[in-house]
Interface confidence: low
């Protein structure tokens, strides 16, 4: 027979629970064994004091009597041959050599029937407090603080952890949240992250990714101060922060058993998130411009921000719907999270810049608005975090109020009057056809362009094809040509300010069509840009290229 | 008064840099397009480059494509024509003019470029 | 590009003449044509816009006619201070383009 107990000596911290293991092997009898419980005290090295029995309930001497009938102290079996002696609240008199026996059940008497093992009670020295976290955050003056961040700001906090027990121990530190005023326990409190008393970092399961990220950070600073660092705050890191130290001791068997516990309330964080505080304003008020004008339109973005940096950025744009057009609109310019800026669809080839002129106003300028810039304006910003390690996250947007915005049409009048000259034409020859274009209103430096068109029958029908162009000039000056059905040489060109010649070479019976003249005119801004500020369309004039009688 | 004051000008070796600055007063800067003119001694007028009032497009000559860039700061009234690779036919006169009717004249600086 | 020739490159008169000058464009410029003048060792000056108008301050002898292609520049009684180089410039299209130059030289 032998009887089993821990290697000796072991350290424990008064006021702490212990459990000292005790199995017999090797014996003979029944498979359920009895266990004794003894204590030899420093003082009285020779006087063995019954603390508990698996076998007789009145075996508790004095000392132990009242601590085993609370429960304070028992016996608990494990199996038939094992059994643990647990002392809920150790006290310094709990020092000195536990003596594990079993009465013997054996036919002869073999072997050892109690094992010896020694506990020394340390007192009470672990100390956790919390510490100033370093300059982020806003901390009023309660205790514990309560500390306001902002969604994507770090949320950092401080614990000061130290021990004076004469033996080697380590600490083990970590940090946990537990929902706002909820009681602190084991089942309420959500680890965050730890150290291990090995140094290795750990963060509950919720965490672990963030921890992975780089995003959660916990460091050593100095011998007894330790420092959490929540990178990208969120809405659900909101809570009641501890910080709960653990003292760690080796036993002589090589396990590691924690000693001591103790936990301190940090601070009740709240996360002010963006979307409760971005709000977007537009100004001036509403505009009323002339074509060409320039248009500048102004939008503040307000609220308890972090400035744009490492936690935080903003991307401002603008919208824009024509009047009477549902929903928000299309885009017209905006600037992203770098600063970058860049214009809508339908908008590039525009004179338009998008710029920040303060720290939390941005503007948009239209060198040279048009008729068509006309409607609702809205300015729409948003706020993004950095989520793990550099990537951003929409974390709120808010658009403004609608801005109208009126610009006057340029009134300009056009009516086109088109004719082939001679009136009747021959095969081979040249057809001239000349268009005649009037205006009335339009600004100075008004310019013409005209297109000639061309639809062709087909049996006898026009044919349900669009018109195709067949050329014109532009604006510019500059001749575009199109394609002519006869696939033959093609001239358009200016033979007055206000009036275009369009003529087809050698005519062939593939020419034979409608054509017309489409003039439009044009207005170029200070910025260079052109808009149509009005168009028309001739009346119809039919080609027909005729036979000479002798041609075959 | 409406007034251009160019500055800026010297001699460089070929292949070497300068950056020439228009000093503008009396009127809305950035309301107007501002050019850059230049004068080879002996020579004719020449446009060398413009550029919108808020700064927005830029314009260039062939000759000096890819080699001047043109700009402007409107908050201090000042245009500015950066020269680099310079050769010795950009010798000249520079002169800085307001609108596309280059109705004011600054009174020019000289530029010389020679080895 | 438009390009700007300028027609006589040099011409002698007295005081008094009547002078004209004509610039044709490679392409119609409509009327964006300006007229300048240059004596040695300033900058030009700007007499007339849009082919017709005249800049402010520039005496009435100068005026400006043409559309399209072809614009001239007359001086109706020709003054001594009238005697330096005039340019045309194109303001169409960019390049802007300046004509060659007419040098009026006392007769």
């Known amino acids: 027979r032998e009887v089993l107990v821990p290697e000796g000596p072991l350290y424990r911290v008064a006021g702490t629970a212990v459990s000292i293991s005790c199995n017999v092997t090797g014996y003979e009898g029944p498979a359920q064994q009895n266990f004794e419980w003894f204590l030899y005290r420093p003082e009285a090295p020779d006087t063995a004091l019954g603390i508990v029995s698996t076998k007789d309930t009145q075996f508790s001497y004095a000392v132990f009597k009242s601590r085993v009938v609370a429960g304070e102290v028992q016996v608990q079996r494990l199996q038939g041959d094992a059994v643990v002696l647990k002392i809920a609240r150790l006290q310094a008199q709990d020092a000195g050599i536990y003596e594990c026996h079993t009465p013997s059940t054996d036919t002869r008497y073999l072997g050892s029937y109690s094992g010896k093992v020694e506990l020394r009670v340390l007192p009470d020295v672990l100390q956790v407090s919390a510490a100033p976290p370093g300059p982020r955050g806003r901390q009023a003056p309660t205790s514990p603080p309560r500390m306001t961040v902002h969604e994507g700001q770090e949320l950092a906090l401080g614990c000061l952890a130290r021990t004076s027990t004469q033996k080697h121990t380590h600490l083990a530190v970590s940090f946990g949240r537990s929902v706002p005023e909820a009681p602190v326990g084991r089942s309420t409190l959500q680890e965050v992250v730890g150290i291990r008393s090995d140094l290795a970092v750990e963060a509950g399961a919720p965490y672990a990714e963030r921890l992975a990220a780089g995003e959660l950070r916990l460091g050593k600073e100095g011998t007894d101060r330790y420092r959490m660092v929540v990178g990208g705050a969120q809405a659900g890191d909101a809570g009641t922060y501890h910080c709960t130290a653990a003292e760690w001791i080796q036993d002589p068997d090589g396990s590691w058993a924690q000693i001591a516990e103790k936990r301190a309330v940090l601070a009740h964080v709240d996360v002010q998130t963006l979307s409760s505080q971005l709000a977007v304003t537009v100004g001036p008020g509403e505009r009323r411009i002339g074509p060409g004008e320039p248009l500048e339109l102004l939008c503040n973005v307000s609220g308890a921000l972090p400035p744009a940096g490492r936690h935080a950025a903003y991307s401002v744009g603008w919208e824009m719907a024509p009047a009477g057009a549902p929903g928000p609109g299309r885009l017209v310019a905006q600037l992203d999270t770098e600063g970058v800026g860049s214009l809508g669809p339908g908008y590039e080839g525009r004179h338009i810049a998008m710029e920040k002129v303060a720290s939390r106003t941005y503007r948009l300028r239209l060198e040279a608005a048009r008729p068509g810039d006309a409607g609702t304006y809205r300015c729409l910003a948003k706020a993004y975090v950095r989520g793990s390690g550099t990537r951003l996250r929409e974390a709120a947007s808010a658009r403004s109020r609608p801005l109208p915005v009126h610009v006057r049409e340029e009134g300009v009048v056009l009516e086109a009057v088109a004719w082939l000259a001679g009136g009747t034409v021959y095969r081979g020859e040249t057809a001239s056809l000349l268009c005649n274009i009037s205006v009335r209103g339009g600004p100075p430096g008004l310019r013409l362009a005209a297109s000639w068109w061309v639809e062709r029958p087909e049996d006898g029908e026009l044919s349900s094809v669009p018109a195709q162009l067949v050329g014109g000039v532009g604006q510019d000056g500059v001749a575009e040509l199109g394609v002519r059905p006869g696939g033959g040489p093609v001239s358009v060109e200016l033979v007055g300010p206000r009036s275009h010649r369009l003529r087809l070479h050698s005519l062939g019976p593939e020419d034979e069509g409608v054509y017309h003249c489409a003039p439009s005119a044009w207005v170029q801004h200070a910025d260079y840009s052109w808009y149509q500020a009005g168009s028309a369309r001739s009346g119809p004039v039919t080609v027909y290229p005729y036979m000479h009688a002798l041609d075959t | 008064e409406v007034q251009l004051l160019e500055s800026g000008g010297g001699l460089v070796q070929p292949g070497g840099s300068l950056r020439l600055s228009c000093a503008a007063s009396?009127?809305?800067?950035?309301?107007?397009?501002m050019s850059w003119v230049r004068q080879a001694p002996g020579k004719g007028l020449e446009w060398v480059s413009g550029?919108?009032?808020?700064?927005?497009?830029?314009y260039y000559a062939d000759s000096v494509k890819g080699r001047f860039t043109i700009s402007r700061d409107n908050s201090k009234n000042t245009l500015y024509l950066q020269m680099n690779s310079l050769r010795a036919e950009d010798t000249a006169i520079y002169y800085c003019?307001?609108?596309?009717?280059?109705?004011?004249w600054g009174q020019g600086t000289m530029v010389t470029v020679s080895s | 590009d438009i390009q700007m020739t300028q027609s006589p490159s040099s011409l002698s008169a007295s005081v008094g003449d009547r002078v004209t000058i004509t610039c044709r464009a490679s392409?119609?410029?409509?009327?964006?044509l300006a007229w300048y003048k240059q004596k040695p060792g300033q900058a030009p000056k700007l007499l007339i816009y849009?082919?017709?108008s005249l800049q402010s301050g520039v005496p009435s002898r100068f005026s400006g006619s043409g559309s399209g292609t072809d614009f001239t520049l007359t001086i109706s009684s020709l003054q001594p201070e009238d005697f330096a180089t005039y340019y045309c410039?194109?303001?169409?299209?960019?390049?802007?383009?300046f004509g060659g130059g007419t040098k009026v030289e006392i007769k």
């Open positions: 003019a307001r609108g596309g009717a280059l109705d004011i």
């Open positions: 009396g009127f809305t800067f950035s309301s107007y397009a």
């Open positions: 550029i919108t009032g808020s700064g927005g497009s830029t």
């Open positions: 392409q119609v410029i409509h009327n964006y």
């Open positions: 849009s082919a017709s």
């Open positions: 410039q194109q303001s169409y299209s960019t390049p802007l383009t």
